[in-house]
């Protein structure tokens, strides 16, 4: 009869009837006394109802802690648990009393009209219809309608308990509008009250807070948090908020159902928390919990409250960013601030605007970084409220992997005359400069492009047995000069030269440059020939529309069948500067050319004349001669470059200047063009004539006027002319001071 916390020597209130269950007849008197060791009280069935007037609880005639419960003329509805408990504790003694009333075996509910049972359509859930019995051992079935169905206890999931009611899986009665319990006593049927069946949902799909994160405010601003719960149909939602400052006067909570589209299988509920003027104590975690009774889902967000608007850079803000050409560079503006600042980026003081190559926002993104992106970038943060500004400079250093200048030219596959001294060059541009440039070599025959050997795009030479130039055993005697540094096209470049003291053996030479971000290499074909010799007449690079002759000279006693060819398109795609040698082995790529044969006492000379040379005539020209005895073919290759015709241009301006009498003036006028232009000087539109005071040097590029006189004042013009036209620049020279009088009067 005792319930409570099981513990050592626990003293519970003592009941006068020492039983767990008491069965009494209707219309008799129920009296139970409860004695204890501290203040106690009684609880009885339906003790919230009006029937309470019938129940009398009195103090015993002895004892500090003793109370007697009396109910005269009990009825079936008095059936239930009678509990005597110690106040302010969970310690109690219970007796279950059955008041047997065969005319009403079911205990009526408080309303006596009908009850409501709420169920969820869940296979695993059971529902209890609270038709309690005033008799413990009744045969009870459950009737559901409409359509009418009867459920009988099966000893498993369907059962009836007089203290609890009828238990059945929810889904079995979810179709029904109402249910009731029925008991048979001596062939008589007795029904409990009707229970209306209400199918309720319980599933909460999600609970979303808006804003969901990163909520920042400053003191005095309004906080509005929306909590939206999405549920299945037939769900009621109870919202519960937890937040830091519960004693908030300006807090407002509004809950409402949101309209969903008709036919939607979902309901939406919204709870809005508003705090009109936040204080620092409102900073913290805000949690919204939505509960449907069977399910609770919650979501949280952190609200940060600042004393006042501010802006500052975060500790992770970089000052130096290193990148390699071609990479994507991201420089995030890491800041702390409220509200979020306006962000502006500058490069070397000039504002940056976003375009397809650069995005200037919270993150400065350079899509494909190039050398010209190197520099100082300033990011300025401006607080939109206080207008406070903070700036930070980030230096961007762009590294360039080694690039070898000669690789960009069409590779000279010229042959080199046996026994001559030759210089091979690699001009390297890299940032940072290469920490080393190494030279390697291998014999040409080890690397010959035999038809049986596959040549790939990435590896045009089938061999990879490169040897260090220090080991020139079996090759040409080599000397590597100390690297030189030169300013070429405005860039600091490293020039490495390899001197072949005597061209005795055909070989391949490779220069390899390495810096911290990469490597670059160039392979040079060094084909040595004892055969014919090619010369150009005139001995210079021709310009478009000029005429040029290629002479192939061979010893008549050794060679015969001199023929000129032009090297045609490659049968295989091969890297620029990586043409396989020797060309004699692959005549399919050669185009035969018309030429004129001349002879002198010892040599045959085959001349191929190009009149009005065009850019299309550029390329590699091959002279082939056959050994009279062995019939072996010997090839010599010469690369012909035709310079484009370019109209004259003058680089740099002549500037107006003021000079005092007796001083000197020195000016220069640099012109470029092809053919090279002639430079002429004019004073006041008349040709300037050299005399003792006027000196023209370096092809008239430099003009010097010594000991200027007043009459030297005027408009000076530099004019550069060629067949393609003229270019000119002008400047006015002002001569100050009085002319000294001579004593010739």
């Amino acid at each position: 009869a005792s319930v409570g916390l099981p513990s050592v020597s626990l003293d519970l209130p003592r009941l006068s009837i020492q039983k767990d269950i008491l069965t009494i007849k209707a219309n008799t008197t129920l009296q139970i006394t409860c004695r204890g060791q501290r203040d106690l009280d009684w609880l009885w069935p339906n003790n919230q109802s009006g029937s309470e007037q019938r129940v009398e609880v009195t103090e015993c005639s002895d004892g500090l802690f003793c109370k007697t419960l009396t109910i005269p003329k009990v009825i079936g509805n008095d059936t239930g648990a009678y509990k005597c408990f110690y106040r302010e504790t969970d310690l109690a003694s219970v007796i279950y009393v059955y008041v047997q009333d065969y005319r009403s075996p079911f205990i009526a509910s408080v309303s006596d009209q009908h009850g409501v049972v709420y169920i969820t359509e869940n296979k695993n859930k059971t529902v209890v219809i609270p038709c309690l019995g005033s008799i413990s051992n009744l045969n009870v079935s459950l009737c559901a309608r409409y359509p009418e169905k009867r459920f009988v206890p099966d000893g498993n999931r369907i059962s009836w308990d007089s203290k609890k009611g009828f238990t059945i899986p929810s889904y079995m009665i979810s179709y029904a509008g109402m249910v009731f319990c029925e008991a048979k006593i001596n062939d008589e049927s007795y029904q409990s009250i009707m229970y209306i069946v209400v199918v309720v949902g319980y599933r909460i799909y999600d609970v979303v807070l808006s804003p969901s994160h990163g909520i920042e405010l400053s003191v005095g601003e309004k906080l509005v948090l929306n909590c939206t719960a999405r549920t299945e149909l037939n769900v009621g939602i109870d919202f519960n908020w937890e937040y830091p400052s519960s004693k908030h006067q300006h807090k407002k909570l509004v809950n409402r159902d949101l309209k969903t589209q008709s036919g939607s299988e979902m309901k939406k509920f919204l709870s809005t928390l508003t705090i009109d003027g936040v204080t620092r104590s409102d900073q913290g975690l805000y949690t919204c919990a939505a509960s449907s009774g069977l399910m609770t889902k919650k979501n949280s967000t952190f609200v940060r409250v600042h004393e006042k608007p501010f802006v500052a850079f975060g500790s992770g803000m970089e000052s130096l960013v290193e990148a390699t050409v071609g990479e994507r560079v991201r420089i995030p503006a890491k800041y702390l601030g409220y509200p979020p600042p306006e962000i502006k980026w500058y490069k070397n003081g000039i504002p940056l605007e976003s375009n397809h190559t650069i995005k200037a926002g919270h993150v400065l993104t350079i899509m494909e970084v190039s050398e010209r992106d190197t520099g100082n970038y300033t990011v300025i943060l401006t607080n939109p409220i206080s207008k406070e500004k903070q700036s930070h400079v980030v230096s961007l250093v762009v590294y360039v992997p080694p690039q070898i200048g000669e690789k960009s030219l069409i590779s000279p596959v010229d042959s080199y005359q046996y026994g001559t001294t030759q210089t091979l060059t690699c001009t390297v541009y890299a940032i940072p400069p290469p920490h080393h440039i190494h030279w390697y070599w291998q014999l040409e025959e080890e690397c010959a492009n035999e038809p049986s050997q596959a040549v790939s795009v990435t590896n045009p030479y089938p061999c990879e047995e490169w040897r260090s130039v220090e080991d020139f055993q079996g090759g040409n005697k080599i000397e590597v000069n100390k690297n030189q540094f030169a300013l070429i096209e405005g860039k600091n470049k490293t020039v490495s030269t390899l001197v072949i003291q005597a061209a005795n053996v055909s070989a391949l030479y490779k220069c390899e440059a390495v810096n911290k971000v990469g490597r670059g290499e160039r392979v040079i074909s060094f084909h040595v020939t004892r055969g014919p010799e090619i010369t150009l007449q005139p001995d210079m690079q021709p310009t478009e529309q000029e005429s040029v002759s290629l002479w192939c000279t061979a010893d008549r006693s050794t060679f015969e069948n001199l023929t000129w060819y032009k090297l045609g398109p490659q049968p295989l795609p091969i890297h620029v500067g990586e043409l396989p040698t020797p060309v004699c082995k692959n005549l399919d790529t050669l185009w035969k050319l018309n030429a004129t044969m001349f002879s002198n006492s010892t040599n045959d000379i085959l001349i191929m004349e190009l009149k009005n040379a065009s850019l299309q005539d550029q390329g590699d020209y091959v002279c082939l001669a056959q050994d009279r005895k062995t019939k072996k073919r010997h090839c010599v290759v010469r690369q012909l470059t035709v310079l484009e015709r370019v109209a004259p241009t003058i680089t740099g301006n002549l500037e107006n200047q003021t000079t005092s009498i007796g001083e000197s003036i020195e000016v220069s006028c640099t012109a470029s063009g092809n053919p090279p232009p002639q430079i002429m000087w004019f004073k006041d539109n008349e040709t300037l004539v050299e005399d003792s005071g006027i000196v023209l040097k370096d092809g008239n590029r430099n003009l010097t006027i010594r000991r200027v006189r007043k009459e030297d004042e005027g408009l000076y013009t530099c004019q550069a002319c060629s067949v393609l036209g003229c270019a000119k620049v002008e400047a006015f020279f002002i001569i100050e001071g009085a002319q000294e009088k001579t004593n010739l009067e």
Partner: antibody
């Protein structure tokens, strides 16, 4: 918050009388049994008297039986201890408390001396 | 004259466990429940344990009570300086028809 506030203590001559009161608040007064406990200076606790919630049952220590009377006015949430024929050995701090011991007042000093 | 007997004093160093006994008879501890009280110097007693072993809310779980036959005991585990006080046991006595208190034990934290 439960509060028990004793009053009525003071100096009295041997053979004299005093009426102590205990005003209660913060709980349903008539539901609880109450008692008086005293503590002589430098001594231990001694139970004096107790009364049931309705006032129907009262109990006294042998040392005060016949001299002290305990009563309560549930309408005024007040407990009374009428002390007659006071003796020097009745000198003590008198505490009003729930009989369960859950709550105690701060006590009132009774001094019996000539 | 007290009917329940307690040792006059008990002591321990901080963190130690101290146990106080309370010895009675069949008419009090033997047939009724025991309460334990703590009295700090100059203050009213405070309930520490009721119904032999139940702790009111707010009382640290370092305090525990037990009863066996006609004796009861209070244990303080992990003794702290603020535990320095007088401790009393109490029970209803069926023969005397009233409450009886123990002689009291003074606990000192060394």
């Amino acid at each position: 918050e439960v509060q028990l506030l004793e009053s009525g203590g003071g100096l009295v001559q041997p053979g004299g009388s005093l009426r102590l009161s205990c005003a209660a608040s913060g709980f349903t007064f008539s539901n609880y049994a109450l008692s008086w406990v005293r503590q002589a200076p430098g001594k231990g606790l001694e139970w004096v008297s107790a009364i049931s919630g309705s006032g129907r049952n009262t109990y006294y220590a042998d040392s005060v039986k016949g001299r002290f009377t305990l009563s309560r006015d549930n309408s005024k949430n007040t407990l009374f201890l009428q002390m007659n024929s006071l003796r020097a050995e009745d000198t003590a701090v008198y505490y009003c408390a729930k009989a369960s011991g859950d709550n105690w007042g701060q006590g009132t000093l009774v001094t019996v001396s000539s | 004259q007290s009917v329940l007997t307690q040792p006059p004093s008990a002591s321990g160093t901080p963190g130690q466990r101290v146990t106080i006994s309370c010895s009675g008879s069949s008419s009090n501890i033997g047939s009724n429940t025991v309460n334990w009280y703590q009295q700090l110097p100059g203050t009213a007693p405070k309930l520490l344990i009721y119904l032999n072993n139940q702790r009111p809310s707010g009382v640290p779980d370092r305090f525990s009570g037990s009863k066996s036959g006609t004796s009861a005991s209070l244990a303080i585990s992990g003794l702290q300086s603020e535990d320095e006080a007088d401790y009393y046991c109490s029970a209803w006595d069926d023969s005397l028809n009233g409450y009886v208190f123990g002689t009291g034990t003074k606990v000192t934290v060394l």
